[in-house]
Amino acid sequence: LMGGQDKPFLSARPSTVVPRGGHVALQCHYRRGFNNFMLYKEDRSHVPIFHGRIFQESFIMGPVTPAHAGTYRCRGSRPHSLTGWSAPSNPLVIMVTGNHRKPSLLAHPGPLLKSGETVILQCWSDVMFEHFFLHREGISEDPSRLVGQIHDGVSKANFSIGPLMPVLAGTYRCYGSVPHSPYQLSAPSDPLDIVITGLYEKPSLSAQPGPTVQAGENVTLSCSSWSSYDIYHLSREGEAHERRLRAVPKVNRTFQADFPLGPATHGGTYRCFGSFRALPCVWSNSSDPLLVSVTGNPSSSWPSPTEPSSKSGICRHLH
């Protein structure tokens, strides 16, 4: 979608959503290439903010402050025209984050969904935000915007995402804004990873020494598959957290991860999923559920020597 005829195309890398103190590269693409260009910020004076400065290829703007938030345009160099410059580009809105307290982000029915399903991402805050923005990590397009609905001292907006495909999986954050400064967004919500399952064949899940164990006996759950998964994810019914481990190639050509659960004190139903490093938020079908039973005197918790990963971070690579 390059600028048509005499209109250049202005874009931002890595994103139009920039944290306070961060940097953003503004690129003005003109006539099948990056020529010299001039930048304008639309404000009440309608004059270039970079007076007389000419940029090549791109301009790294930063460290950004709230004053950098707003609408930008560029003009490409056109030596043989009367003015020497092209028509103004498309408008590009730069949003600066970190200007108000962060909102909260929740997924309904949950962050783990099957391909084709729809998820509602609810952004809410006790700050009376007029608008909420939803942004997916790594995407350079403008974030989705919704008007906040205010009830009982809480402002919220529901973003509907779906039907879910692999391209929609990833790490989401939401922001709030007020009309006083519409392009100065709040701090980001805590990240929320939306995971799509059901794209690849299911792994198998087994328990050592077996699915029924004595209280206090050490239990290890093994997830394995013939598919060359890079990572396995183990989830326990009723728990928000999942554990993940790198898959290890075995002599029998399977790929396996062994999850040590420690001394058995409490049973539960477990499932595991496989995923590839390139698409960490796109998981296989679930393994068949495995019910682990503990005989003896079960207590209310199962201490885990491997710290479960946080609610977020699923979509980051394991190094």
Partner: antibody, heavy 118, light 112 residues
Framework: QIQLVQSGPELKKPGETVKISCKAS????????MNWVKQAPGKGLKWMGW????????TYADDFKGRFAFSLETSATTAYLQINNLKNEDMATYFC???????????WGQGTTLTVSS | DVLMTQTPLSLPVSLGDQASISCRSS???????????LEWYLQKPGQSPKLLIY???NRFSGVPDRFSGSGSGTDFTLKISRVEAEDLGVYYC?????????FGGGTKLEIK
Amino acid sequence: QIQLVQSGPELKKPGETVKISCKASGYTFTNYGMNWVKQAPGKGLKWMGWINTYTGEPTYADDFKGRFAFSLETSATTAYLQINNLKNEDMATYFCSRSFGSTYGDYWGQGTTLTVSS
Amino acid sequence: DVLMTQTPLSLPVSLGDQASISCRSSQTIVHSNGNTYLEWYLQKPGQSPKLLIYKVSNRFSGVPDRFSGSGSGTDFTLKISRVEAEDLGVYYCFQGSHVPWTFGGGTKLEIK
């Protein structure tokens, strides 16, 4: 309940400095912006600017750039208006008001009267 | 700056009458987000202003339903269906769509 309580009346000489306080209670201070509004004797209301209570970032109307400064003491949930090098035309009642979301002044302080006289 | 012009300057009314105050902006006050941040305030003698209406027509909590706001673009109106003694004072319109935010000059509602 939500309250904005301002400091008492001030009598100053031209050239001096005054600092007016606005103490907020009954709500989360950093969730709302704070406006400052001037009302000269027998005149209408004039918006001076506002301060973002989360970041401390002030915005001033053109007529109030230079001698005027907004500041915060977040731990004390208090906003301040300081006027330096006082002039006779600064004689007025100054109001603080809370704003955010859809409304720009849902709660107001009672006003602080500043008298400037030599 | 957006100039907010209120008419009339003074409005003498009898209690129980309907009152109407007009406010005109020198340019459209539709915000870039599509909303119109036009508010109405009442200031009684010796008191701070009180918010009556926000976003053109929304009554602030606790404001009696005899107060209503309307209008769009550059022309706005505040109506009081049956004036009561407690309604007397100076009414100000205010725009928060374009910086600097600006107040109208005020309309004094008084007893005939």
